[in-house]
Amino acid sequence: MKVLQEPTCVSDYMSISTCEWKMNGPTNCSTELRLLYQLVFLLSEAHTCIPENNGGAGCVCHLLMDDVVSADNYTLDLWAGQQLLWKGSFKPSEHVKPRAPGNLTVHTNVSDTLLLTWSNPYPPDNYLYNHLTYAVNIWSENDPADFRIYNVTYLEPSLRIAASTLKSGISYRARVRAWAQCYNTTWSEWSPSTKWHNSYREPFEQHHHHHHHHHHH
């Protein structure tokens, strides 16, 4: 039994780091393998992660962590019974994939304005709480070409757009994801999408132009 692709890990910079690797053949990850991890710090105990299968020869392990600081470094040991298959280390701050934002809501009760709000996925004591920026994706369920991205580069988890920038009388969906420049993170996963029916009263003189819209990237 050998490791074909060494473990690579990403951290949510709060409580979970996820490591994935591939073996050289079909493996029952949970019964045959164990990933031991230990913070390089005083008093730290070794923890055992039981991997799950991720495709025939792939394994994935979710490492639970109480907290995280920038300087953290973990030792990783992959065992098959008494045999050490691989030894490595992992610095969570260098491989961050933020948690996905949640609670995306579209408020349509403001006259001719759409207000999208969502929740920051981190508590205030986490460094990323004040360092996330967001991308909001809005698309039409009726027209695949009507797809746009709004970059939210301020800290407030909200976006205001004029309802008239979208077509009236059709349904739209929105979703949001996050990243943090400070740790050069990857993008988070998208939040669950939310749906609303876009309707607004157009001034008569704009009526013939309501199909025009801009794509934002």
């Epitope: 409580s15 710090f41 005083l42 109480d66 600081v69 920038s70 300087a71 508590p123 460094y127």
Partner: antibody, heavy 116, light 112 residues
Framework: EVQLVQSGAEVKKPGATVKISCKAS????????MHWVKQAPGKGLEWVGR????????IYASKFQGKATITADTSTNTAYMELSSLRSEDTAVYHC?????????WGQGTLVTVSS | DIVMTQTPLSLSVTPGQPASISCRSS???????????LEWYLQKPGQSPQLLIY???NRFSGVPDRFSGSGSGTDFTLKISRVEAEDVGVYYC?????????FGQGTKLEIK
């Protein structure tokens, strides 16, 4: 041996500023959060705030926002807390504590007395 | 802010007898990572506080097994199965789950 050694007692006049230090040995403060805890004479423990020494990220209890400023110097392995606009109610023992992720190591405390 | 309320505020116990201290939080102290950072500290006379229990039930290294922690949600308890003379001091519960972190007001244990 792990130790947090704090600076000595201070006596200050109302309105003054004081800066107390906490030097760590036996570990690197970059590997922990450094917290400060207040204990007024004959009273209980009160959390002031904390710093991540690597990036300088601080959070404070709202009561101490504007009163306390926590800093750290990773080159000397030392955390600091400055208390400004001192008043008699700031008279207390202030403890530095390392948390990873619980308060395992405490400094001996620094008594700050505010008196005219 | 989460208020941590300890009862009783003082306790007088005969050596060898059990003691129990309750700590109630004003709201849930489950952290967003799923853990409950409820800790117990003992401050002996003239000393800095020392850690006894972390994450509700875990004894810190070197802490005698006569100390135990229990509880969940908003109700937590520290028990000393047989009090010894060296256990005198003030016991504090602490929540490190939500900012601002908060201590209970303390329970003074003395020996009869």
């Amino acid at each position: 041996e792990v130790q947090l050694v704090q600076s000595g007692a201070e006596v200050k006049k109302p309105g003054a500023t004081v800066k107390i230090s906490c030097k760590a040995s036996g570990f690197n403060i970059k590997d922990t959060y450094m917290h400060w805890v207040k204990q007024a004479p004959g009273k209980g423990l009160e959390w002031v705030g904390r710093i991540d020494p690597t990036n300088g990220y601080t959070i404070y209890a709202s009561k101490f926002q504007g009163k306390a400023t926590i800093t750290a110097d990773t080159s000397t392995n030392t955390a600091y807390m400055e208390l400004s606009s001192l008043r008699s109610e700031d008279t207390a023992v202030y403890h530095c504590v390392s948390r990873r992720p619980w308060f395992a190591y405490w400094g001996q405390g620094t008594l700050v007395t505010v008196s005219s | 802010d989460i208020v941590m309320t300890q009862t009783p505020l003082s306790l007088s116990v005969t050596p060898g007898q059990p003691a129990s201290i309750s700590c109630r939080s004003s709201q849930s102290i489950v952290h967003s990572n799923g853990n409950t950072y409820l800790e117990w500290y003992l401050q002996k006379p003239g000393q800095s506080p020392q850690l006894l229990i972390y994450k509700v039930t875990n004894r810190f290294s070197g802490v005698p097994d006569r100390f135990s922690g229990s509880g969940s949600g908003t109700d937590f308890t520290l028990k000393i199965s047989r009090v010894e003379a060296e256990d005198v001091g003030v016991y504090y519960c602490f929540q490190g789950s939500h900012v601002p972190y908060t201590f209970g007001q303390g329970t003074k244990l003395e020996i009869k």
